[in-house]
Structures are given as structure tokens and as C-alpha cells.
């Protein structure tokens, strides 16, 4: 059938979702597209438990998540409600800082070295995490 019952090769299963952790860096939009081409999305963190799981796998490295405010309000890429949902920002963040000298503010969220979140320039080449839910229409594990 078309239901995914197990995670693709090189993905990690956790709480009925599959996660893929990059070991290289891309700008936020490129990371977002990368995940979409895997029939997935940048990780959406909905609980403290999921936060701890992702944090354990990425280590102390800046890593993109599926949260941005490029069109105004903060939005999760899968439509999860931001206002009522889980948040783990660093103190004083997000601050839409303009002082970096790269033009514009900071519209994309990432995990920092301690796991808490920061907003940053979307063009920075950070690692990223893709997530897809089990039991949704998708493909079998890749065979190479």
C-alpha cells in the first residue's frame, strides 16, 4: 500500500515520526526544499520531549527547524499553530536583529548550541533536520 509503516533508510524513528539529521549546511530555504523533496518537512517541535530528542541527536550545533516569520507572523511549515504551541526560545529571542550587516532582520529559527531557539539570517548555511510522520502516504525505504 501507500502507507509508510517504517522509516526510510538512514532516518530515525521516534514517537510515530521519522527524522533525518543533516551533517552539512544549507540556507533555510534550501534545507526546506531538501526536506520537501523527501516528502518531509523541516522539523516541527511540538513538545519538550520532542525538543530533547532532537537536541540529543544534533548536539551543540546550530541547526534549522521548520519555523519562520518571513511573511510576518511566526509560522510552522506544517501549519501547526505557533501561538498555542511549544516554544523554547533563548532569553530575549526572537529579536529580529538587524545589526549583523547582512541586510534585513532575522526570519528563520534554529536550535542553538544549548538547544534553545534563536532567530537568524535565513541565508546562513546551518545544518537541518527533516521530519515526516509515519502512516502517511509515502514511499518505501530507499534502496541503493
Amino acid at each position: 500500500g501507500s502507507e509508510r509503516t517504517c522509516c526510510p533508510v538512514n532516518w530515525v524513528e521516534h514517537e510515530r515520526s521519522c527524522y533525518w539529521f543533516s551533517r552539512s549546511g544549507k540556507a533555510w530555504a534550501d534545507a526546506d526544499n531538501y526536506c520537501r523533496l523527501e516528502d518531509a518537512h523541516l522539523v516541527v517541535v511540538t513538545s519538550w520531549e520532542e525538543q530533547k530528542f532532537v537536541q540529543h541527536h544534533i548536539g551543540p550545533v546550530n541547526t534549522w527547524m521548520g519555523l519562520h516569520d518571513q511573511n510576518g507572523p511566526w509560522k510552522w511549515v506544517d501549519g501547526t499553530d505557533y501561538e498555542t504551541g511549544f516554544k523554547n526560545w533563548r532569553p530575549e529571542q526572537p529579536d529580529d536583529w538587524y545589526g549583523h550587516g547582512l541586510g534585513g532582520g532575522e526570519d528563520c529559527a534554529h536550535f542553538t548550541d544549548d538547544g534553545r531557539w534563536n532567530d537568524d539570517v535565513c541565508q546562513r548555511p546551518y545544518r537541518w533536520v527533516c521530519e515526516t510522520e509515519l502512516d502517511k502516504a509515502s514511499q518505501e525505504p530507499p534502496l541503493l
Epitope: 501507500s2 526510510p8 538512514n10 543533516s22 551533517r23 552539512s24 549546511g25 544549507k26 540556507a27 530555504a29 534550501d30 526544499n33 531538501y34 520537501r36 523533496l37 523527501e38 516528502d39 548555511p125 502516504a137 509515502s138 514511499q139 518505501e140 525505504p141 530507499p142 534502496l143 541503493l144
Partner: antibody, heavy 121, light 108 residues
Framework: EVQLLESGGGLVQPGGSLRLSCAAS????????MSWIRQAPGRGLEWSSV????????YYADSVKGRFTISRDNSKNTLYLQMSSLRAEDTAVYYC??????????????WGQGTMVTVSS | DIQMTQSPSSLSASVGDRVTITCRAS??????LNWYQQKPGKAPELLIY???SLQSGVPSRFSGSGSGTDFILTISSLQPEDFATYYC??????????FGQGTKVEIK
């Protein structure tokens, strides 16, 4: 054996339409994003379009956006490219290619033999 | 979009020669750089991925190096079957892949 076999090319008048097909075998087709890449006579390679394994996500080069539609039928292990409003500059060999990726490794690892599309009056 | 520029556009060499082809990206692409070989009338074939990793089945006389914006494909000792056109390709800002214009390696 992993194989991609394109068909559907031919001569078409400017403004006309054509549908290319690519039959895949030897691998789990629905597990991979697939792409169309073209090469005008005597010219280099130009990426044209890509579709995710489920068909849920598609992307196009600016040169074909709004005129070409990539699709797939995973039950038939077949990739398609519907081309409309064709122009002389669309004349090329069209290759279908399998995308393989795992982070740094993001490549077109299997290519078909190509099918020629000629747009001329 | 990221532009890829190869040089030279063509070169003449003899069997046994060491050949180098360069590829420059219009912005940093880290190591997201692949090389393909295309023989006349045939489809391209993957040679090297991630700037320096050799694709399975490709002879060890092919090697790649570089990161950021500047990359090199080297053929340590040119063989008769290596006369072909070589393309670099960036996979940094997927899904907009771009190729270099190609380098044709001809027999001197």
C-alpha cells in the same frame, strides 16, 4: 538492472504540446525524486524539473515554469513531462534522471538514454 | 541562482597526460559539487560527488578537490576512453541544480 527509458519525443510546431514518458525499472521507483534534464543540440545540460517520490512536491526551472508539468504514476513506475506552449528554444534531448541523496551526496545517479524534442514549423 | 563556470571550454591532450578542469561557483557552495562525464550521443554519467568522492565503478585516475567556490577535476593519466565532455554541477541550492557549460577533452 537499474534502467530508465524515455519515449514520446518528436517534431512539434511552436505553440504545440507534447508528453514525454520515462519508464523506470530495477529500483523502488516511489522511493526517489525524479527529474527531467535537457540538452539543446551542441549545448550543455540544463535542469528542467523535479518531483518528489510521492509526487507531492514539484519544482521547475524558470525557463519552463508555467508551461511544463512534471508528474508520476508510481503504480506504473513511470515519470511524465507534459510540455505545452512549446518554443524553438525548447528543442533539446530530454533526459529523465533518478536523484539520489544523503546529505552531501545529492546527485543524478541514473540517467535515461534521452528522447529528442524538435520544435519547428 | 548559482552560476557555474568551467575552464577551459575545451582542451587537447594526449593519452597519458595529466588533465585538470576547473569549475567556479558564483557563490560558496561548500562541497556540494558533482562531476559528470558525457560521451557523444550518450547520457551523462556521474563521476564524482561531494567535490571529492569517487562514484562506485569510476577509475581511480579521476579525482576531485576543492570547496567553497573553486573546484578541480583531475585525470591523472588520460586514457582513450576518457575523451569526452565533462560537466560540473552544484547541488547546494536544490531544487535548482545548475551545471557548468562543459569542458570538451579532445585528442591532440
Amino acid at each position: 538492472e537499474v534502467q530508465l527509458l524515455e519515449s514520446g519525443g518528436g517534431l512539434v510546431q511552436p505553440g504545440g504540446s507534447l508528453r514525454l514518458s520515462c519508464a523506470a525499472s530495477g529500483f523502488t521507483f516511489r522511493s526517489y525524486a525524479m527529474s527531467w534534464i535537457r540538452q539543446a543540440p551542441g549545448r550543455g545540460l540544463e535542469w528542467s524539473s523535479v518531483i518528489s517520490g510521492s509526487g507531492g512536491s514539484t519544482y521547475y526551472a524558470d525557463s519552463v515554469k508555467g508551461r511544463f508539468t512534471i508528474s508520476r504514476d508510481n503504480s506504473k513506475n513511470t515519470l511524465y513531462l507534459q510540455m505545452s506552449s512549446l518554443r524553438a528554444e525548447d528543442t533539446a534531448v530530454y533526459y529523465c534522471a533518478k536523484r539520489y541523496n544523503s546529505g552531501w551526496h545529492d546527485v543524478f545517479d541514473i540517467w535515461g538514454q534521452g528522447t529528442m524534442v524538435t520544435v519547428s514549423s | 541562482d548559482i552560476q557555474m563556470t568551467q575552464s577551459p571550454s575545451s582542451l587537447s591532450a594526449s593519452v597519458g597526460d595529466r588533465v585538470t578542469i576547473t569549475c567556479r561557483a558564483s557563490q560558496s557552495i561548500s562541497r556540494y559539487l558533482n562531476w559528470y562525464q558525457q560521451k557523444p550521443g550518450k547520457a551523462p554519467e556521474l563521476l564524482i560527488y561531494a567535490a571529492s568522492s569517487l562514484q562506485s565503478g569510476v577509475p581511480s585516475r579521476f579525482s576531485g578537490s576543492g570547496s567553497g567556490t573553486d573546484f578541480i577535476l583531475t585525470i591523472s593519466s588520460l586514457q582513450p576512453e576518457d575523451f569526452a565532455t565533462y560537466y560540473c554541477q552544484q547541488s547546494y541550492n536544490t531544487p535548482t541544480w545548475t551545471f557548468g557549460q562543459g569542458t570538451k577533452v579532445e585528442i591532440k
